[in-house]
Interface confidence: low
């Protein structure tokens, strides 16, 4: 999927929303506080400019900017391992003045039987073993400590947890004579949290468990368990929240049914059904109780597990997610798309939009893409004029204000942002589409025609002539 797009940051970014963390006094961490905007609503631009100016003038004082890297720490408890028995671990960049912790779960599909796990080990060993992990990683997107790249949480303690368990972060089985591979995704998260408590997490105010793709699904499967773990360990004051990016999948009917041969072609329900048994997978307790024994696979699907979660979760999902299309056996080759497939793709967007109807905190652009939050240009995409960092900032504010009785959304600060336009790339801020084979940029008109969209059909609801639409899309791509 990577080959189909190019993402570039604009050379410049809109000003970041105001930081909500105070500078630490005399070396000790200070509580972060929300800003009350009511007094400045009349002259917000001027106020924001002042805050930005202040942030920029203070930023050089921070020693953090000297090293952008997150440093690798292999788990001290070496019995919590990757698939091949090597110790799992995490990359950490501390921000001592901050009481926010961001734990990011990496994605990367899964394997669900001996055969496709062997194949994965041959071709993608980094996702099954820690043996060749680099000692440092650069934080990008939401993991960046640069305010320009990460206007949302640039000052947080950043933790990147590499995915090396191939189990959608759900497994709880160790390597043994019987088991060629360990699947310990759920246990890795628990162990990382335990070790981080000794590295400053114990003083956290907010822990945001985030993840992309399989990591996004991992967030849905583990966020409540992390909250429960911290409560049991004596840290009930740490607010645990989730941010699930590109992990909200549908167990819909495949475009073309194929036998469950490999990870990519196997229908998601069947892959997960087999996987849970192979991994000894665990799902959130409240969700598990809603389904019969053997039906736990249901809890891997966002729209089924979400209503059972206690922690607040923000869902980020492209309406036309490439991984979803892949498991649905939709492969956009060089050939123009037939009408049946076009309708299937449009219907997928409609279904996904429907599943997000009751998710108050969500960001779903009508784009064909996959993953966003750790891409450098994650600030570029907007839904109805609001960027993702801005929506997350509004979410933070809404959670802070939620002890007040009002459930109404904050004025001018939306958190439910789901595109309503009906075809892929109808949002002008979508990332550039590239031809899967030639790598050439396709303008939106080319892309839509390639996908078999009849320009008359697309133009009509917009009150346009097809020729006008083509011109507009070619120019606005």
């Amino acid at each position: 999927s990577e080959g189909r797009k190019t993402w570039r940051r604009r050379g410049q970014q809109p000003p970041p929303p105001p930081r909500t963390e105070a500078a630490p006094a005399a070396g000790q961490p200070v509580e972060s506080f929300p800003l009350d905007f009511t007094a400045v609503e009349g002259n917000m631009d001027s106020f924001m400019a002042q805050v930005k100016s202040l942030a920029q003038s203070l930023y050089p004082c921070s020693a953090q900017q000297l090293n952008e890297d997150l440093r690798l720490h292999l788990l001290l408890n070496t019995s919590v391992t990757c698939n091949d028995g090597s110790p799992a671990g995490y990359y950490l960049k501390e921000s001592r003045g901050s009481r926010r912790w961001l734990l990011f779960l990496e994605g990367g599909w899964y394997c669900f039987n001996r055969e496709n796990c062997d194949s994965r080990y041959d071709t993608m060993r980094r996702l099954m073993s820690s043996r060749d992990w680099p000692r440092t990683r650069t934080g990008t997107g939401i993991l960046s400590s640069q305010p320009e790249e990460n206007p949302y949480w640039w000052n947080a303690n950043m933790v990147f947890i590499p995915y090396c368990s191939s189990d959608v972060w759900s497994g709880a089985s160790s390597k043994s004579e019987k088991n060629e591979y360990a699947f310990m995704g759920a246990l890795i998260i628990q162990e990382v949290v335990r070790e981080l408590l000794g590295r400053g997490l114990s003083g956290a105010k907010v822990l945001l468990l985030a993840g992309s793709s399989a990591g996004g699904t991992g967030v849905l499967l583990n966020v409540d368990r992390v909250a429960e773990q911290l409560e049991k360990l004596g840290y009930p004051a740490i607010q645990v929240r989730g941010l699930a990016d590109s992990g909200w999948f549908l167990d819909n009917k495949q475009y073309r049914h194929t036998d469950c041969v490999d990870t990519i072609t196997c229908a998601p329900t069947e892959a997960i059904r087999r996987g849970i048994r192979y991994w000894n997978g665990v799902v959130p307790e409240r969700c598990r109780r809603q389904f019969q024994e053997g039906e736990e696979w249901n809890c891997f699907f966002g729209y089924k597990v979400y209503p059972t979660l206690r922690c607040p979760v923000f869902v980020v999902q492209w309406l036309f997610d490439e991984a979803q299309l892949t498991v649905d056996n939709v492969h956009l080759t060089g050939q123009p798309v037939q009408e049946g497939l076009r309708l299937y793709i449009q219907n997928l967007g409609r279904e996904l939009r429907h599943t997000l109807k009751d998710v108050p905190a969500s960001f779903a652009p009508a784009c064909l893409s996959h993953e966003i939050i750790i891409r450098s240009h994650w600030t570029d995409v907007q839904v109805k004029g609001t960027s993702l960092p801005r929506a997350l900032h509004c979410w933070d504010r809404s959670l802070h204000d939620s002890h007040k009785a009002s459930k109404t959304p904050l004025k001018g600060c939306p958190v439910h942002l789901v595109d309503s336009c009906p075809w892929p790339h109808c949002n002008p801020s979508c990332p550039t589409v590239r031809d899967q084979f030639t790598g050439q940029e396709m303008n939106v008109a080319q892309f839509l025609m390639h996908m078999g969209f009849d320009m008359q059909t697309v133009a009509q609801p917009q009150g346009l002539e097809p020729s006008e639409l083509l011109g507009m899309l070619s120019n606005g791509s």
Epitope: R8, G11, G385, C421, P428, N443, E468, G471, S477
Partner: antibody, heavy 119, light 111 residues
């Protein structure tokens, strides 16, 4: 630093030809659609031509169609505008500009090169 | 082609006051929640500089005293408080279809 620098302008007789160039630096040129604009003395801005990032798509203003040709060389980070059958009304400052990858706005402009068509 | 009518053609505003420039399109330039209207500033001898994109988004590096609003056919650029350096000609531009056209410009003078 993101930069566009035009060159190739000058004085030319009506019916003559001229080739303008635009050298790009500081960004991945091959990722962006590029445009030419012009501005006659004391007048407003007029769009001239567009070329997509991979040269697949080109568009021209009606006033220049058949006389001007836009092209690009991504290996050399260069945009060109070949102008033939020049007329006095083509006299203007010519700018190249980078189209932001979405939304159809122009976030980087060159400093311009002057074309004067006069006998 | 979509015609953009800018008004006024020129205006003089005192330092610290508000300048308001309007741009009306001959056809709707908004669709699916997005408005394809952008604003530029041009000073003599210089190329245009992007100020506002997609109607209301402030380009990075542009002072927060600039703001854009509007949808459909009617759009506004506001500058408040006006500063000396804001003396320039301002253009609106649409990208709803090809060709992208510009307004005729508004010359802002600081009193």
């Amino acid at each position: 630093e993101v930069q566009l620098v035009e060159s190739g302008g000058g004085l030319v007789k009506p019916g003559g030809s001229l080739k303008l160039s635009c050298a790009a630096s500081g960004f991945t040129f091959s990722d962006y659609g590029m445009h030419w604009f012009r501005q006659a003395p004391e007048k407003g801005l007029e769009w001239v031509a567009y070329i997509s990032s991979g040269s697949r798509t080109v568009y021209y203003a009606d006033t220049v169609k058949g006389r001007f040709t836009i092209s690009r060389d991504n290996a050399k980070n260069t945009l060109s505008l070949q102008m033939t059958s020049l007329r006095s009304e083509d006299t203007a400052m010519y700018y190249c500009a980078r189209k932001h990858y979405n939304g159809g706005y122009f976030d980087v402009w060159g400093t311009g090169t002057t074309v004067t068509v006069s006998s | 082609d979509i015609v953009l009518t800018q008004s006024p053609a020129s205006l003089a505003v005192s330092l610290g006051q508000r300048a308001t420039i309007s741009c009306r399109a001959s056809k709707i330039v908004s669709t699916s929640g997005y408005s394809y209207m952008h604003w530029y500033q041009q000073k003599p001898g210089q190329p245009p500089k992007l100020l506002i994109y997609l109607a209301s988004n402030l380009e990075s590096g542009v002072p927060a005293r600039f703001s854009g609003s509007g949808s459909g056919t009617d759009f506004t650029l506001n500058i408040h408080p006006v500063e000396e350096e804001d003396a320039a000609t301002y253009y609106c531009q649409h990208s709803r279809e090809l060709p992208p056209t510009f307004g005729s410009g508004t010359k802002l003078e600081i009193k």
